[in-house]
Interface confidence: low
């Protein structure tokens, strides 16, 4: 080549990423790389992740002479070592009056009576543990249940015989069953009294309730 096309190794500099070129011979050069880079022209970023300290499931993301940790949602901080307080971030994390309890790497809900599930959104099926008498129908409620009794049965658990079945109340009186003991209660029409509403009452008296 002519003198007008002389090769000068460091002009222009072949070193990239801030590397400094040093001519070592007529046609040779050496690149002094900035921290975080390697290769004959400093073209390669050194992977800092083999020595990473990302914790708790954090994923290492290489940087220039450094690395960052991409943390799972439950963790934060430079190395994913700081617990995220989900209870602060999500005030409504627990439903139906449940209390949020922050934990290392997550959170939990302390549910009020009658609710269950991770976020207290599931109504506990109280009928699963109910003792309604066979033949009756259990109805689940929040933290309780009720028993729908078949004809002839009464009481909270339908475990009592319905005393109204024998029509003990006379004169068109209304018959109710005491859910605690199964006894009938007659609500007498005007002018009658007594357990069965069979007695006349004095003028001026109105409805009477009689328990039996």
């Amino acid at each position: 080549a002519g003198s007008d096309s002389l090769y000068v190794p460091c002009a222009p500099s072949p070193c990239v990423n801030g590397g400094t070129c040093r001519q070592t011979g007529d046609f040779t050069f050496e690149c002094n790389c900035l921290p975080g880079f390697e290769g004959s022209t400093c073209e390669r970023n050194i992977d800092d992740c083999p020595n990473h300290r990302c914790q708790n499931g954090g994923v290492c993301v290489d940087g220039v002479n450094t690395y960052n940790c991409r943390c799972p949602p439950q963790w934060t901080g430079q190395f994913c070592t700081e617990d995220v307080d989900e209870c602060l971030l999500q005030p409504n994390a627990c439903q139906n009056g449940g209390t949020c309890a922050n934990r290392n790497g997550g959170y939990g809900c302390v549910c009020v009576n009658g609710w269950s599930g991770d976020d207290c959104s599931e109504n506990i099926d109280d009928c699963a543990f109910a003792s309604c008498t066979p033949g009756s129908t259990c109805i689940d409620r929040v933290a309780s249940f009720s028993c729908m009794c078949p004809e002839g049965k009464a009481g909270l658990l339908c475990h009592l015989d319905d005393a109204c079945i024998s029509n003990p109340c006379h004169k068109g009186a209304l018959c109710d069953t005491n859910p605690l003991n199964g006894q009938y209660i007659c609500t007498c029409p005007q002018g009658y009294k007594g357990a069965d509403c069979t007695e006349d009452v004095d003028e001026g008296n109105s409805h009477h309730h009689h328990h039996h």
Epitope: P50, N51, H52, R53, C54, Q55, N56, G57, G58, C60, Q78, F79, T81
Partner: antibody, heavy 120, light 107 residues
Framework: EVQLVESGGGLVQPGGSLKLSCAVS????????MEWIRQASGKGLEWIAA??????????VYSASVKDRFTISRDTSKSTLYLQMNSLKTEDTAVYYC???????????WGQGTLVTVSS | DIQMTQSPSSVSASVGDRVTITCQTS??????LAWYQQKPGKSPKLLIY???RLQDGVPSRFSGSGSGTDYTLTISSLQPEDFATYYC?????????FGGGTKVEIK
């Protein structure tokens, strides 16, 4: 209760091999980084090997002093950490500890240690 | 590798004394430092992690402080059971490295 119990130490000739075991219990083994640290008599602590957790593919790091001679591994089904030591030198004589990396820059559980003596 | 310079190498103190041990690192370790206590024939016990956080079950007379490259372990009122060797350790980058240790002896 977190427990780590090392075994397998003993007397071995220079150039020989030895395999140390560390049986762990009381925590989910695959969730934690595990480390081997050694201590020569009357000297300080020297970290020699680590195995990251399952989330980090159980990848491995060694100190320059044992690289290519020692191998760290674990059997999660047996909840046991191992250190296979080959081409042993007299300067490898030490008490070897396995420890659990608690995830916040601290080694929060240690075994009782097992003595390895390399001598002819 | 990150170099750990711990001082003093030994200290003589009496029960009730305040004892301070320092650890200097060769580069910023962003509070990634732990302190351990070791008694003869026993394995090390974690006292402080993350430069200043007290490990569960460790008495509150132990405290840690510092940032960047300079860290300190303080025992506010030395108790008979505290006579032991103490080590600092950086957990910021592999290889993990330890300080040379500080032996706390009875005066």
């Amino acid at each position: 209760e977190v427990q780590l119990v090392e075994s397998g130490g003993g007397l071995v000739q220079p150039g020989g091999s030895l395999k140390l075991s560390c049986a762990v219990s009381g925590f989910t083994f695959s969730d934690f980084y595990m480390e081997w640290i050694r201590q020569a008599s009357g000297k300080g602590l020297e970290w020699i090997a680590a195995q990251r957790n399952k989330a980090n593919d159980f990848s491995i790091v060694y100190s320059a002093s044992v690289k290519d001679r020692f191998t760290i591994s674990r059997d999660t089904s047996k909840s046991t950490l191992y250190l296979q030591m080959n081409s042993l030198k007299t300067e490898d004589t030490a008490v070897y500890y396995c420890s659990r990396d608690g995830g916040k820059w601290g080694l929060d559980a240690w075994g009782q240690g097992t003595l390895v003596t390399v001598s002819s | 590798d990150i170099q750990m310079t711990q001082s003093p190498s030994s200290v003589s103190a009496s029960v009730g004394d305040r004892v301070t041990i320092t650890c200097q690192t060769s580069e910023d370790i962003y509070s990634g430092l732990a302190w351990y206590q070791q008694k003869p024939g026993k394995s090390p016990k974690l006292l402080i992690y993350g430069a200043s956080r007290l490990q569960d079950g460790v008495p509150s007379r132990f405290s840690g402080s510092g940032s960047g490259t300079d860290y300190t372990l303080t025992i506010s009122s030395l108790q008979p059971e505290d006579f032991a060797t103490y080590y600092c350790q950086q957990g910021f980058k592999y290889p993990l490295t330890f300080g040379g240790g500080t032996k706390v002896e009875i005066k």
